[in-house]
């Protein structure tokens, strides 16, 4: 039994880091393998993660962490019974994938303005809370070409757009994702999408 693709890990910078790897053949990850992880910190304990299958030869493990700070470094040991298959380390702050924003809501009752709001996925005492920026994706269910991205570079989790920038009488969907420049993170997953019917009063045209 050998590791074909070494574990790579990403952290949500709050409580979970996810590690994925591939074995050289079909493997029952949960029965055959264990990933041990330990914070490099005086008198910290080693913890055991039981991996799950992720495709025939792929494995994934969700490492639970009390908290994350920028200095944290973890040792990782992948075991098959008594055999050490791989040894490495992981610094969560260098491999951050933020949590996805939640509670995306479209408010359509603000004159002819659409107000989109969502929730920051982090609590106020987490470093990322004040460092997230967002991308909002809006698309038409009827017209695949009607697809747009709005970059929200301010901290407030909201976006205002004129309803008239979208077609009237058509259903639209929106979703939002986050990233943090300070840690050069990857983008989060998209939030669940929300749907609304776009309707607004066309301006009266004089001939």
């Amino acid at each position: 039994m050998k590791v074909l693709q070494e574990p790579t890990c990403v952290s949500d910078y709050m409580s979970i880091s996810t590690c994925e790897w591939k074995m050289n053949g079909p493997t029952n990850c949960s029965t055959e393998l264990r990933l041990l992880y330990q914070l490099v910190f005086l008198l910290s304990e080693a913890h055991t993660c039981i991996p799950e299958n992720n495709g025939g030869a792929g494995c994934v493990c969700h490492l639970l962490m009390d908290d994350v700070v920028s200095a944290d470094n973890y040792t990782l040991d992948l075991w098959a019974g008594q055999q050490l298959l791989w040894k490495g380390s992981f610094k969560p702050s260098e491999h951050v994938k933020p949590r996805a924003p939640g509670n995306l809501t479209v408010h359509t009752n603000v004159s002819d303005t659409l107000l989109l709001t969502w929730s920051n996925p982090y609590p106020p005492d987490n470093y990322l809370y004040n460092h997230l920026t967002y991308a909002v994706n809006i698309w038409s269910e009827n017209d695949p070409a009607d697809f747009r991205i709005y970059n929200v570079t301010y901290l407030e989790p909201s976006l205002r757009i004129a309803a008239s920038t979208l077609k009237s009488g058509i259903s639209y969907r929106a979703r939002v994702r986050a990233w943090a420049q300070c840690y050069n993170t990857t983008w989060s997953e998209w939030s669940p999408s929300t749907k609304w019917h776009n309707s607004y009063r066309e301006p009266f045209e004089q001939h």
Epitope: L39, V40, F41, L42, L43, S44, E45, S70, A71, D72
Partner: antibody
Framework: EVQLLESGGGLVQPGGSLRLSCAAS????????MHWVRQAPGKGLEYVSG????????YYANSVKGRFTISRDNPKNTLFLQMSSLRAEDTAVYYC?????????????WGQGTTVTVSS | ETTLTQSPDTLPLSPGDRASLSCRAS???????LAWYQQKPGQAPRLLIY???RRATGVPGRFSGSGSGTDFTLTISRLEPEDFAVYYC?????????FGQGTKLEIK
Amino acid sequence: EVQLLESGGGLVQPGGSLRLSCAASGFTLSSYAMHWVRQAPGKGLEYVSGISSNGGSTYYANSVKGRFTISRDNPKNTLFLQMSSLRAEDTAVYYCVRVKVGYRGGMDVWGQGTTVTVSS
Amino acid sequence: ETTLTQSPDTLPLSPGDRASLSCRASQSVSSAYLAWYQQKPGQAPRLLIYGTSRRATGVPGRFSGSGSGTDFTLTISRLEPEDFAVYYCQLYGSSSVTFGQGTKLEIK
């Protein structure tokens, strides 16, 4: 209420032994690394020893290495410090201390201390 | 092993004043592992700040911590009578625990 209560201090002759105990209440001892910190009369704080949450790993300051032994009985929610070959410079108030991992070494709960006096 | 040096040894101030206490490490350390404690006569120390700048539960907002590398500061924005005590910085590293020698904040 979260509390640590030390006991076992007293007067001992140089070269003698003493065993300190620390009873924890209001929290589960097995979830925390635990430590002993001491303070000589009129002096500052000095780190003595620590033990990981399951007891598998221990650490000692150079000044007590080979003479002191830290241990714990998680089911009984108790921490111990066995002190032997005691010297006059070990005279101090000994505090039992909890470290919250999320506090990255911040010692968030302290006992009231027990006094050890080494004198002939 | 890293040593921590606090200054000044004694700081005479009056209630209402702003206090700045310094803690200097002999080599660069992670700010994540730097803490501050307050100790009053006859009492056990009390955790004030951990991770250089994060206030422990129940600590008033007038206490704040800052710094990085080798230089760290505990600031008390407006001294109350109950703040006059001895303050210690502490480093909890990957292989050792160290305390500074303390700064005594006394009433002028």
